[in-house]
Interface confidence: medium
């Protein structure tokens, strides 16, 4: 019996050659499929093409990356995989929303309001404060600065708000 599998041209790339008595067969490796549509074939008439596993393998809120003969899933930013692996292939894994506001109260800085959203969060300021125009949530340096009244030139005697204004301690009323 001749071992046809000894010939490197007996089967295409990404295929396994199986020698039988007086014959041989080619089978595509896992993650690849035959261009002929047949499970077994001979020679280079068919090729083994990468199966795009990314059509349905990854859970919601994740990105699928197809690799030769395989794939992996990665959760979107703001989501974490339920098995703790950054790149995963397990079918049962979910990408769950992270509550950034609970994880770290300093996410938005002092005098701020952090609001969790699906896959993200947003920062705002409590009454009497407004966002610092030089900071940005995207860069992680969001901050809130006190809103000061513009002082009137005519000082009203015994007016508490005017006095606070001159001392730089007055804040804009919440209403």
């Amino acid at each position: 019996d001749v071992d046809e599998c000894a010939d490197p041209r007996a089967c295409p790339e990404h295929a396994t050659c199986n020698n039988t008595v007086g014959n041989y067969s080619c089978f595509c490796n896992p993650g690849f499929e035959s261009s002929s549509g047949h499970l077994s074939f001979q020679g280079l008439k068919a090729s083994c093409e990468d199966i795009d596993e990314c059509t349905e393998m990854c859970p919601i809120n994740s990105t699928c990356t197809n690799t030769p003969g395989s794939y992996f899933c990665t959760c979107h930013p703001g989501f974490a995989p339920s098995n703790g692996q950054l790149n995963f292939t397990d079918q049962g894994v979910e990408c769950r929303d992270i509550d950034e506001c609970r994880q770290d109260p300093s996410t938005c800085g002092p005098n701020s309001i952090c609001t969790n959203a699906l896959g993200s969060y947003s920062c705002g300021c409590i009454a009497g404060f407004h966002p610092n125009p030089e900071g940005s949530q995207k860069d992680g340096n969001f901050s809130c600065q006190r809103v000061l009244f513009k002082c009137k030139e005519d000082v009203i005697p015994d007016n508490k708000q005017i006095q606070q204004c001159q001392e730089g301690t007055a804040v804009k009323p919440a209403y």
Epitope: A80, G84, I98, D99, C101, R102, Q103, S106, N116
Partner: antibody, heavy 116, light 112 residues
């Protein structure tokens, strides 16, 4: 897999200092804060403190003067240091993380005995 | 500091009973972001605690639907509709809204 593992001295003499290490895997300390919780024998849970992802810390008011938490992001390790130990510091010490929601990831705990 | 008071400290039950545990905070635990970070944990002997409920009423992944949480402001309740043997242990409420963070003293759920 998200894992946290504490390692400590086991036995410490009164008035001495304590250092416990928490080694984490499955996530990065640059993205997640680590909390410390302890439980004296037969008693309840007590929150000790936290080091947030950005490196900021908060501590239990009653223990603040004796506690310090630090970390090494590159080694995936968090350190709990406590000085002037007394017998009532005998407890199981846990490191804990908030992976999604609440304290959903706990270490198995390390037992500390303060005794002469 | 926010103090968390649990009642009762011990709760004897028969399997299949409904159980209810109360948790009261010394001040409002509504976070500045509007969320109330009140959580419930179960600790069984020789094990680390396990998260059951987060943000007052949300069951954590894998927690049976016989567990439910409710409440607002300063008063919170954990209910177990039909107690099973695996539910026995010590239940802790916890507030994660204001540092320093604090646990309740715990409620031991045990068989009559």
């Amino acid at each position: 897999q998200v894992q946290l593992k504490e390692s400590g001295p086991g036995l410490v003499a009164p008035s001495q200092s304590l250092s416990i290490t928490c080694t984490v895997s499955g996530f990065s300390l640059t993205n997640f804060g680590i909390h410390w919780v302890r439980q004296p024998p037969g008693k309840g849970l007590e929150w000790l403190g936290v080091i947030w992802s950005g490196g900021g810390t908060n501590y239990n008011s009653a223990l603040m003067s004796r506690l310090s938490i630090s970390k090494d992001n590159s080694k995936s390790q968090v350190f709990l240091k406590m000085n002037s130990l007394q017998t009532d510091d005998t407890a199981i010490y846990y490191c804990v993380s908030i992976y999604y929601r609440g304290f959903d990831s706990w270490g198995q705990g390390t037992t500390l005995t303060v005794s002469s | 500091d926010v103090f968390m008071t649990q009642a009762p400290l011990s709760l004897p039950v028969s399997l299949g009973d409904q159980a209810s545990i109360s948790c009261r905070s010394s001040q409002s635990i509504v976070h500045s972001n509007g969320n109330t970070y009140l959580e419930w944990y179960l600790q069984k002997p020789g094990q680390s605690p396990k998260l059951l409920i987060y943000r007052v009423s949300n069951r954590f992944s894998g927690v049976p639907d016989r567990f439910s949480g409710s409440g607002s402001g300063t008063d919170f309740t954990l209910k177990i509709s039909r107690v099973e043997a695996e539910d026995l242990g010590v239940y802790y409420c916890f507030q994660g809204s204001h540092v320093p963070l604090t646990f309740g003293a715990g409620t031991r759920l045990e068989l009559k």
